[in-house]
Structures are given as structure tokens and as C-alpha cells.
């Protein structure tokens, strides 16, 4: 069979070889397509409900005014010329539709090096057959599941038109110290050969390199966190980061209802002030960072000072 590729919605003419150019003609077209069950016979004197889909022209050719997905299949013509010689024509028709230019939607303007990031979603609408989407970095194909690259794909079919919508979501983990402005693009490759790929406009997100965080230091005065009843304890949260982050305070793992401040003063210490304290620094560019914990405890007169309060871990200090 001769392979014919036709674009959806376009007309198609299939020649019936050996047919006399004008009536009377002894010919018959048989088709087995998505519109038929087994074979449907069309003759020159036909004409009727099938005319919207396929009809025999005066010269014996079969005319399809606007091919559709259901017209994919086999078309055969059997013709006899004036001398009684029989000729057969056999066609396999496949249809295609080129989608609109693919687009990258929900694209990221900034990526963070060293962690997985969603770059964007590539969308292609109105293809047949489905075809495929692929991603490119600086013009080179990106291979999923390699070097921190992952792709999530989805294919949907329109219930009425039968055309496909493809979606491909790209996730990447940029290497530290890599290209600060990588160029990503996406391309649609048709399911039928001989049609070139369609490529999106490129996107160029910035890659942000997170600065390794320095530890949040919690300084306690008096050192060791043990104080006589009625004494004062000063807790200072030191964060080297710029700009200065917001500092909140925790006691026994519960946030204290105080305005943000790098210094917490506990005057006139009483039994209710005993516990484990820490500070939490919240940066605009990364998540919250918690300091080590210190135990604040009360020492009765006669007890040895600094050794009575333990520092760090989850030490509860010495109870009076």
C-alpha cells in the first residue's frame, strides 16, 4: 500500500489508477477506517450521507473534503478500463496535526544551587499523533534521571477533537559554582516523521548560590546559666548574617510571646524562669535557624555556682 500522510482539516484526493477519466466507469472504492466496521463500499453513482467524509469524483478519484482522525485507515480502488483490464490502487492514510508553538508556563525566575527546583512546565496543545516534549539546557538535550534532572509528563486527549495536549514539568538541581544564567528551552517533536520540531522561547532563570550559614551563637550571662534567686540573666543571640535576621526566643521548646530582639533579659529570677532557652534566627532568604539550648537554673546560697547549671543539649539544670 502507498503511504499517504494528510493534515487534519485539509482536503485529500486519492487517485483511482486505471479508471476511465469520465463516466461511465466501472470502479469501486472500499475503505476501512475509523468510520467503518470492516469495509465500506463507495461507488461513482453513490452520493449520500458519506459525501461529507468521502465521495467519488467524476474522474474516479476519491475526494475527502476535510480529513479527520477517523479517516485513518486503508483505501482501495478497483477499476476496469474500457478494454476490461483491471487495476487496483491501495493507500494507507495517516493523519496529523501540528500543534501551536509550545510554551513554558509557571517558569521560575530564580533557582537555588544544590537543591531541586521546578524550572517550569512546557505545554503543547492540539497535536496528532501525540508527539513528544523534550527539554534543552544551553541548546543540549537534558536527559531525565541524570545529574539531578527529573521530568513529570502528562498527556490528555480532547474528548471531541481527539487532539492531544502534552505537559512536561522540569525539575533540576543546579550544581554549585555552575552557570549563573542557564538557558532552558523545550521542544515538541511530532509523532509522524518529516516534520521539524517546534521550540519554545528560551527562559533564563538566575541561579542563586546560598552562602553557607554560620552558626547562631547563644551567649548566657552569668556563664553557665546558674543564678541566685532574684538575680538577673542576660541571653544574647549572635548571628553573623547580613542583613540581620529576626530573633525570636523559645523556652522549653515553646515560643515566648515577646517581640523580636537579639537580647533577652530575665530580671529578678524566680522558680518560674527556670528552664531551657534557645533563640531562633529567621532569615528572609532561608528558613529559621535555631541556636544551641542553655539551661537556666536557680542556686541556693552555699551551692557552687557555674557548675550547677548545665549548658547545651537538653540539660534541665539543677533544681533547688
Amino acid at each position: 500500500a502507498q503511504n499517504i500522510t494528510a493534515r487534519i482539516g485539509e482536503p485529500l484526493v486519492l487517485k483511482c489508477k486505471g479508471a476511465p477519466k469520465k463516466p461511465p466507469q466501472r470502479l469501486e472504492w472500499k475503505l476501512n477506517t475509523g468510520r467503518t466496521e470492516a469495509w465500506k463500499v463507495l461507488s461513482p453513482q453513490g452520493g449520500g450521507p458519506w459525501d461529507s467524509v468521502a465521495r467519488v469524483l467524476p474522474n474516479g478519484s476519491l475526494f475527502l473534503p476535510a480529513v479527520g482522525i477517523q479517516d485513518e485507515g486503508i483505501f482501495r480502488c478497483q477499476a476496469m478500463n474500457r478494454n476490461g483490464k483491471e487495476t487496483k490502487s491501495n493507500y494507507r492514510v495517516r493523519v496529523y496535526q501540528i500543534p501551536g508553538k509550545p510554551e513554558i508556563v509557571d517558569s521560575a525566575s530564580e533557582l537555588t544551587a544544590g537543591v531541586p527546583n521546578k524550572v517550569g512546565t512546557c505545554v503543547s496543545e492540539g497535536s496528532y499523533p501525540a508527539g513528544t516534549l523534550s527539554w534543552h539546557l544551553d541548546g543540549k538535550p537534558l536527559v531525565p534521571n541524570e545529574k539531578g534532572v527529573s521530568v513529570k509528563e502528562q498527556t490528555r486527549r480532547h474528548p471531541e477533537t481527539g487532539l492531544f495536549t502534552l505537559q512536561s514539568e522540569l525539575m533540576v538541581t543546579p550544581a554549585r559554582g555552575g552557570d549563573p544564567r542557564p538557558t532552558f528551552s523545550c521542544s515538541f517533536s511530532p509523532g509522524l516523521p518529516r516534520h521539524r520540531a517546534l521550540r519554545t522561547a528560551p527562559i533564563q532563570p538566575r541561579v542563586w548560590e546560598p552562602v553557607p550559614l554560620e552558626e547562631v551563637q547563644l551567649v548566657v550571662e552569668p556563664e553557665g546559666g546558674a543564678v541566685a534567686p532574684g538575680g538577673t540573666v542576660t541571653l544574647t543571640c549572635e548571628v553573623p548574617a547580613q542583613p540581620s535576621p529576626q530573633i525570636h526566643w523559645m523556652k522549653d521548646g515553646v515560643p515566648l510571646p515577646l517581640p523580636p530582639s537579639p537580647v533577652l533579659i530575665l530580671p529578678e529570677i524566680g522558680p518560674q524562669d527556670q528552664g531551657t532557652y534557645s533563640c531562633v534566627a529567621t532569615h528572609s532568604s532561608h528558613g529559621p535557624q535555631e541556636s544551641r539550648a542553655v539551661s537556666i537554673s536557680i542556686i541556693e546560697p552555699g551551692e557552687e555556682g557555674p557548675t550547677a547549671g548545665s549548658v547545651g543539649g537538653s540539660g534541665l539544670g539543677t533544681l533547688a
Partner: antibody, heavy 119, light 107 residues
């Protein structure tokens, strides 16, 4: 609203003529073939005529061929049936319906208009 | 011309009954058969298209099937509003041919 509305029915003498109209609304008229179907009093349904979406091709059963003419005006979203040489057996309710080819066949109907051929 | 022989021409049934109406085509018409419902004084309404497909807005108790040139309309559980006349139509070839109709009446 998607609808078809027929008009033009009435009483006519045998041998006379009548023109039926069908006004379409709520859909893209020129995407569809259109068809006329009739129903004689107390009888079943009978196909009368079909026309393709461009109006270039028309189709009739032998019972009305050469007497009836189906036409359309896509600019006016209208379908017509010109009936000449009317006979008593043409007495029926005439329905206009959307479709007429293998893709869409009579999926939407008008309310019908009565044609009475009598002396 | 293709003949569509519809049977029975009438039937009496009760609400809740399963009802089956058959049309036999005189030659192969593929899947190109529709079923219609018509109530007195009203226009027909398409129920089933291309032998087996339920038209929009039609209750799921209606179904269509095909075996060769035999086409069947089934109402799984007859409802009061289903008492009407039913027609099949072949549209594989001209002239388009309707079956003679089946009147479904209350027993």
C-alpha cells in the same frame, strides 16, 4: 439557546406551492448539513430532503424529487423547502432537523409546521 | 433501497419493566443507526446515535446495541415519562429510512 424554528405551513390546494422556512440559532449553522423530515397524520417519520453545509449538494427521495427543492442561506442561518405540485399525500407536519450526514444525523429538531393539501 | 423492519409495532408494559425494541436492516449499514423517541404532538428527540452511543441529556436506562444488521433499543427500567413512540433510522445510504415505529403503552 440552540434551536430550530419552522414557519410557512398552511392550507394549500393540490397542485399548489408552498415555501417552508427554518430559522436556526445558538450554533454555527454552516458547520452542519440540514434535513427536512415529515410525518403524515397518525403515521411514521419520512425523510424529505437534505443539504450539505455549503448548499452545493442536495439529496431527495424519489417521492419528492423534481417537486421539492431544499436550499439554505448561511448568512441568514436559514433553511428552506420549496414545495411545488403539491399532492394530498404531502399533507404532514414538516420538521427541520440538524445534520444529515454520517457525522451528525438529526440531533436537533424544530417543533414542526403543518402543511395541509386539500381542495 | 434499505428497509428497516422495526418490531414490535406496539407493546404494553408496566413501570419498572425492561423493554426491548428491535430494528433489522435489509443490508449492512455498519454502525449508522440512530434511535428516536416521540411523544404525541411533539418533535422527535434523538436518544442513541451510531447504534450504541447515548445522546446528551438522555437517561442511562436507555441503551443501544448492534449485532450485524440487527439493532436493539433497551429501556432497562421503564419510567412513566418513557411511554411514547420509538423510531430507528438508518443513515448509511440514501434514501434515509426510518423504521415503522414502536408505540410503548401503559399496561
Amino acid at each position: 439557546e440552540v434551536q430550530l424554528v419552522e414557519s410557512g405551513g398552511g392550507l394549500v390546494q393540490p397542485g399548489g406551492s408552498l415555501r417552508l422556512s427554518c430559522a436556526a440559532s445558538g450554533f454555527t449553522f454552516n458547520n452542519y448539513w440540514m434535513t427536512w423530515v415529515r410525518q403524515a397524520p397518525g403515521k411514521g417519520l419520512e425523510w424529505v430532503a437534505s443539504i450539505d453545509n455549503s448548499g452545493d449538494n442536495t439529496y431527495y427521495p424519489d417521492s419528492v424529487k423534481d417537486r421539492f427543492t431544499i436550499s439554505r442561506d448561511n448568512a441568514k442561518n436559514s433553511l428552506y423547502l420549496q414545495m411545488n405540485s403539491l399532492r394530498a399525500e404531502d399533507t404532514a407536519v414538516y420538521y427541520c432537523a440538524r445534520g444529515g450526514d454520517i457525522r451528525v444525523m438529526l440531533d436537533l429538531w424544530g417543533q414542526g409546521t403543518l402543511v395541509t393539501v386539500s381542495s | 433501497d434499505i428497509q428497516m423492519t422495526q418490531s414490535p409495532s406496539s407493546l404494553s408494559a408496566s413501570v419498572g419493566d425492561r423493554v426491548t425494541i428491535t430494528c433489522r436492516a435489509s443490508q449492512d449499514v455498519g454502525i449508522y443507526v440512530n434511535w428516536f423517541q416521540q411523544k404525541p404532538g411533539k418533535a422527535p428527540r434523538r436518544l442513541i446515535y451510531r447504534a450504541t452511543n447515548l445522546a446528551d441529556g438522555v437517561p442511562s436506562r436507555f441503551s443501544g446495541s448492534r449485532s450485524g444488521t440487527d439493532f436493539t433499543l433497551t429501556i432497562s427500567s421503564l419510567q412513566p415519562e418513557d411511554f411514547a413512540t420509538y423510531y430507528c433510522l438508518e443513515f448509511d445510504e440514501h434514501p434515509l429510512t426510518f423504521g415503522g415505529g414502536t408505540k410503548v403503552e401503559i399496561k
